[in-house]
Structure formats: C-alpha cells, structure tokens
C-alpha cells in the first residue's frame, strides 16, 4: 500500500506484506551489491560473511509469537535495521568514486532503495496491526524476544573489519526476512484465524 494509507482488505494487505518480504529476502537487492561495492567479492572473504548467531530473532522464535506479537517484533527489528542501514550508507563510496573505480552505479542505487522499501513494509505492518485490532477475535499477545536493540557491531579495529561486520549484518537481515516470509505464508485466509 502507498505510504501513509491503509488498505482495509486483509488479503490485499497480507499479499503486500508477503510480496515485500519475498523481495527483501533476495540477496541480489542488498547483500550482493554491498559485497561488490566493498570489494569483498572474493571466495575467501565471502566465507567470513556469515551472520553472528543471535543478531536477529530466529524463525522458531517468530513462529512462537501470536500474530500481534510477531508484528511488534518485526516492527522493532526493522527499526533497528533502519538505524544500521543508515550507518552503512554513510560509509559507502560516493557515486563519482564508484565510477572512477569502474564499479556499477546500479549497485549503489539498489542499496539506497533498501531504506524506503523497509519504510513501506513498516507502513503495511502498522496497517495490518490496526486491521487485526479491529477484527473480531482477540488473540493474546506474546511478548517478542526479538531484537529490540540495534544489532551492535563488534568494535571494529579498521575499515576492513567494519566492511565484514556490515556484510554479516546484511546476511543476517536476508535470513531474517526469509523467516518472516515463511511465517507470513502460514497466515490464514481470514484475519480471525491462522493456520499453524
């Protein structure tokens, strides 16, 4: 849905959430361009680009939450992701530097689309939370054990270490969105019930 407006149709809203998470788990939209821009596209370095366990809520944790709790956890985690992406963006080379070094400007544009896309997703999360609140059947909200603090980078000794940290973070983010997509795919056809 467009930013700031809410669809009142549950299945349209759920479809939009499913579509957004479907696209956000695609590494070609964020992780892959980051790896190329930062010069990490080397087999040996790629091995180090694995997420640190615990940086994001696991799929098991997400599945254990009620729908409202899941949305709260997702929203909080995405808030942390937005902070982290802002930090990563500040450390990226500028467009003219990329051109000079023969790197693809499209990769930078892809990275810069990530935050608007997350804002669009958060808008739909807000809309879905509203819609669930207005639906007939109340559901107890289990508190999410998700990331309420931004996943903190380990102290980086140098710029290279920070690049690797960014890489691990983005790897974890895509994995997290994959889990989110799997949870959304199990939501029922009505706002009042969920297939488990």
């Amino acid at each position: 849905a467009a930013i700031g407006s809410c669809s009142k149709e549950y299945r349209v809203l759920l479809g939009q959430l499913q579509k957004q998470t479907d696209l956000m788990q695609d590494t070609s939209r964020l992780l892959d361009p980051y790896i190329r821009i930062q010069g990490l596209d080397v087999p040996k370095l790629r091995e180090h680009c694995r997420e640190r366990p615990g940086a994001f809520p696991s799929e098991e944790t997400l599945r254990g939450l009620g729908r409202r709790g899941f949305l709260q956890t997702l929203n909080a985690t995405l808030g942390c992701v937005l902070h982290r992406l802002a930090d990563l963006e500040q450390r990226l080379p500028k467009a003219q530097d990329l051109e000079r070094s023969g790197l693809n400007i499209e990769d930078l544009e892809k990275l810069q689309m990530a935050r608007p896309n997350i804002l669009g997703l958060r808008n739909n999360i807000y809309c879905m939370a509203q819609l669930l609140d207005n639906s007939d059947t109340a559901e107890p909200t289990k508190a999410g054990r998700g990331a309420s603090q931004p996943p903190t980078p380990t102290p980086a000794s140098d710029a290279f270490q920070r690049k690797l940290e960014g890489c691990r973070f983005l790897h974890g983010y895509h994995r997290f969105m994959h889990s989110v997509g799997r949870v959304f795919s199990k939501w029922g056809e009505s706002p009042n019930r969920s297939r488990r």
Epitope: A1, S5, S7, K8, V12, L14, S185, E189
Partner: antibody, heavy 120, light 106 residues
C-alpha cells in the same frame, strides 16, 4: 506445463446468467489462487474476483451482488457464474493463475478466454 | 479505486528503435505489473514487481518507476513486439489495469 482451459457459451440472453468452467493442468488448485478478469472494448480489462487456494473468495465490489466463484480441487476445475447479464457485460472472460501460494493479485498464466456476447 | 493512465494510447516504432511507454497512477502504488497482448492471444505477464522480468521474457524489456509514475522500455524494437501493453496495480483494492498502449511496427 501450466494451462488453463475455459469452456462456456458464446451467447447469453439479456437477464440470463453466464457460467464458465476453467479446467487447470500443470498445478494444483490447493496451492494457487485463480482470478477472473474480463476485457471489453468499452471498459478495457477489469478484475472480477478470485478464489484462493483455501477456498476463500474476493469479489470486485462492482460485481459482488451477481458473481459467484467456486471450485472442485479434485477435478482441477474453477466455476464462474455471473447473473443478470446485460449488453454491457459483452466481453472476453479470462481465468488466470496467481503466481504462487501467497495472496498475490497479479497473473502469471492466463486462460484461453471465453468470448461472451449478450444479445437477444 | 486507483485509476491507471497509460500514454501514449498508440505509438509506432522502427525495428532497432528504443521504445518507452508510461503508466501514471491516480494514487501511489508499491509495485507495477506489465502485460503484453497480441491479437487473438491471451495476455502474457511481462514485468512483475516493477522491474523483474517474468519467465521467458527477452532482456530487451525493462520496467522502472515508483510512486505514481512507472514506465516500460524496449531497448531495441523487434517486429514480434508489436502488441498492446497493459499496466496493472494491486496495492489498493480492487486490482486495476491501465487502458493500454498499442505499439505498432513502422
């Protein structure tokens, strides 16, 4: 490969109902939604409704009062029925497949189309 | 409901020429979808999620845009591209289509 074959009458009397069957192959109706879209010279392409994999339906509000979509998963058939047809319902009617098991409201494979003329 | 306005309504291009057509929404949408329809055939999905090529679609087709403004581009026109092209949105209920751009070969 994925196919949607349609069967139904070409001519319908005014005020009568239209029934079209969409028989699918290459995928299961328990995994994908099937939408209905019509195309007329005056109004272009119009989305009419959908039946989702679990059997829930959504209809365009403009047609809700006279539209019914049902299915038989075991026979791989979707049934479309529209009542009280008038001359401006003359169009090509298509069934079309949703691209995956999620609630996606666009169409990756379209049926063969049924040309319907409403006339006495 | 969201009204999608396509322009131009009709256009022609020579083989090898670059072609761009636009789709403008009455409100902002998240993603745009494009279909190609040839006479006597059913519509065919061309572009999904604004810029992703559907299966089997030649790389000369591309899509872009955001908000209320979207476009479909053919980098080098070929005779087989002569068809009518429709945009579609489903960010807002009900899903709606543009009225089409008819592309002819010169």
């Amino acid at each position: 490969q994925v196919q949607l074959k349609q069967s139904g009458p070409g001519l319908v009397q005014p005020s009568q109902s239209l029934s079209i069957t969409c028989t699918v192959s290459g995928f299961s109706l328990t995994n994908y939604g099937v939408h209905w879209v019509r195309q007329s010279p005056g109004k272009g392409l119009e989305w009419l409704g959908v039946i989702w994999r679990g059997g829930s339906t959504d209809y365009n509000a403009a047609f809700m009062s006279r539209l019914s979509i049902t299915k038989d998963n075991s026979r791989s058939q979707v049934f479309f029925k529209m009542n009280s047809l008038q001359a401006d319902d003359t169009a090509i009617y298509y069934c079309a497949k949703s691209p995956n098991s999620n609630f996606y409201w666009y169409f990756d494979v379209w049926g063969t189309g049924t040309t319907v003329t409403v006339s006495s | 409901q969201i009204v999608l306005t396509q322009s131009p309504t009709i256009m022609s291009a020579s083989p090898g020429e670059k072609v761009t057509m636009t789709c403008s929404g009455s409100s902002s949408v998240s993603y745009m979808y494009w279909y190609q329809e040839k006479p006597g055939s059913s519509p065919r999905l061309l572009i999904e999620d604004t810029s992703n090529l559907a299966s089997g679609v030649p790389a000369r087709f591309s899509g872009s845009g955001s908000g209320t403004s979207y476009s479909l581009t053919i980098s080098r026109m070929e005779a087989e591209d002569a068809a009518t092209y429709y945009c579609q949105q489903w960010s807002s209920y009900p899903p709606t289509f543009g009225s089409g751009t008819k592309l002819e070969i010169k």
